[in-house]
Amino acid sequence: EEELQVIQPEKSVSVAAGDSATLNCTVSSLIPVGPIQWFRGAGPGRELIYNLKEGHFPRVTAVSDPTKRNNMDFSIRISNITPADAGTYYCVKFRKGSPDVELKSGAGTELSVRAKPSAPVVSGPAVRATAEHTVSFTCESHGFSPRDITLKWFKNGNELSDVQTNVDPAGKSVSYSIRSTARVLLTRRDVHSQVICEVAHVTLQGDPLRGTANLSEAIRVPPFLEVTQQSMRADNQVNVTCQVTKFYPQRLQLTWLENGNVSRTEMASALPENKDGTYNWTSWLLVNVSAHRDDVKLTCQVEHDGQPAVNKSFSVKVSAHPKEQGSNTAAENTGTNERGSSDYKDDDDKHHHHHH
């Protein structure tokens, strides 16, 4: 009589998570009588996966009817595969006895589970950074198998090169995670920019997963300030304008100072957006020249997004203007927060008349 062979024809089987895996096993002889058991792993710590003789294995079914006369096919099907099912499975023949005695094992079939990576999650810096600085974005994706994976970063469609990527763990595992950091130089034009983390994996059939982050969450574009004086009005009032342009985000506080004393404080709100995502704001101050003996030093002080205040000053010359009797008003607080007055949108140089 030839010796019994336990034949596992496939050295390896690869299955997508959620699918069923078929592990094939046949024996070469009906002799000796005794059951087949399936184990994951070898040695004393092996895990029983299926025992034809007894036990309840809800996810495992015999491919062939075990009660079929002269059955020599002991293949099994494992349903709803997860990455945790990965490993080497052994079909083991036992000889009937009390208890049954292990006789021979098949060579084993390695089950690898193809699991899709999770949707990449991109996170930016915890605090905003000013344009012309470099910030880091991280991208994470988890739960994929096999380990081979490709991750790319793009900013506005252009691939980024300052990237560091790690796949964990380094050794064998049922599933893996990837973490990548990209360093991005912010420019003043990046309010509407986007970084994309793109993950390609064998399970995705050439359809990579993408995670995005808007640079608007990470960037601060500081304003340009310009203070100008309009021509003298007939009523001896001078209209001084503070133009705050090309800033982002909108959070901005403007304070007028007359000779160092606070005249008025205003908060920007509901401003129209420029094409590039930045904002402009214009504030006026009416100065009654006849109420002053000396020149008036006006300062437009802007605090943007919690950053240190930026000042721009302008002196109104009063020596050239005759004083008017009976006037006790130094400056008028009217008509100074006209939000609709900012018509410049993206006409870059129209309002950049810097008077120092």
Epitope: V33, L52, T67
Partner: antibody, heavy 119, light 110 residues
């Protein structure tokens, strides 16, 4: 440890029916055939029928086809053999036996149930 | 149906001697290289016990003084050295088709 425990002895009148039970333990009931064999006093073994508990497929000895019915209750891992229209020559020990190797053989046996048919 | 005929009907053998029981099938019980013959031992008041399966394979726990041989239609059960506890009735059974038993052979000590 495979065990087949059969119901107790029965005394029946001719023309009556008897239903013998066989409760299995120590293995997965649905994975192996159950055979029924009888032995009249001082006589040899006579195969009656077999049943696959997984799907209730049955095979009968032609001699018993019209009078014997095999059933199973998988919830209790119990096999039943009912024999109708009893005659005095049906007096016998009725055995259930499990086919462990799917070879249509009888590897493990119950201890038997004596059915006496007498008027 | 395949009919199995055992011979002899009864047999008396001295302790320590060889006992041989024959089983002849009315047609071949071989298929796919296997001989579908099984041998059972039945002691008084007990159910039968499987000794040999597929003509020549000893069931686990059965003493190796028991052996089976044969193919096609003619099969033999041999006890190489009879022991007192071997006194019993021996049956052959085939499963080439639906099972049938031989009529049995009674083995006694001479």
């Amino acid at each position: 440890q495979v065990q087949l425990v059969q119901s107790g002895a029965e005394v029946k009148k001719p023309g009556a029916s008897v239903k013998v039970s066989c409760k299995a333990s120590g293995y997965t009931f649905t994975n192996y055939w159950i055979n029924w064999v009888r032995q009249a006093p001082g006589q040899g073994l006579e195969w009656i029928a077999m049943i696959d508990p997984s799907d209730s497929e049955t095979h009968y000895n032609q001699i018993f086809k019209d009078r014997a019915t095999l059933t199973t209750d998988t919830s209790t891992s119990t096999a039943y053999m009912e024999l109708r229209s009893l005659r005095s020559d049906d007096t016998a020990v009725y055995y259930c036996a499990m086919d462990y190797g799917s070879l249509y053989a009888m590897d493990y046996w119950g201890r038997g149930t004596l059915v006496t048919v007498s008027s | 149906d395949i009919v199995l005929t055992q011979s002899p009907d009864s047999l008396a053998v001295s302790l320590g001697e060889r006992a041989t029981i024959n089983c002849r099938a009315s047609k071949s019980v071989s298929s796919s290289g296997y001989n579908y013959i099984f041998w059972y031992q039945q002691k008084p008041g007990q159910p039968p016990k499987l000794l040999i399966y597929l003509a020549s394979n000893l069931d686990p726990g059965v003493p190796d003084r028991f052996s089976g041989s044969g193919s096609g239609t003619d099969f033999t059960l041999t006890i190489s050295s009879l022991q007192a506890e071997d006194v019993a009735v021996y049956y052959c059974q085939h499963s080439r088709e639906l099972p049938t038993f031989g009529q049995g052979t009674k083995l006694e000590i001479k």
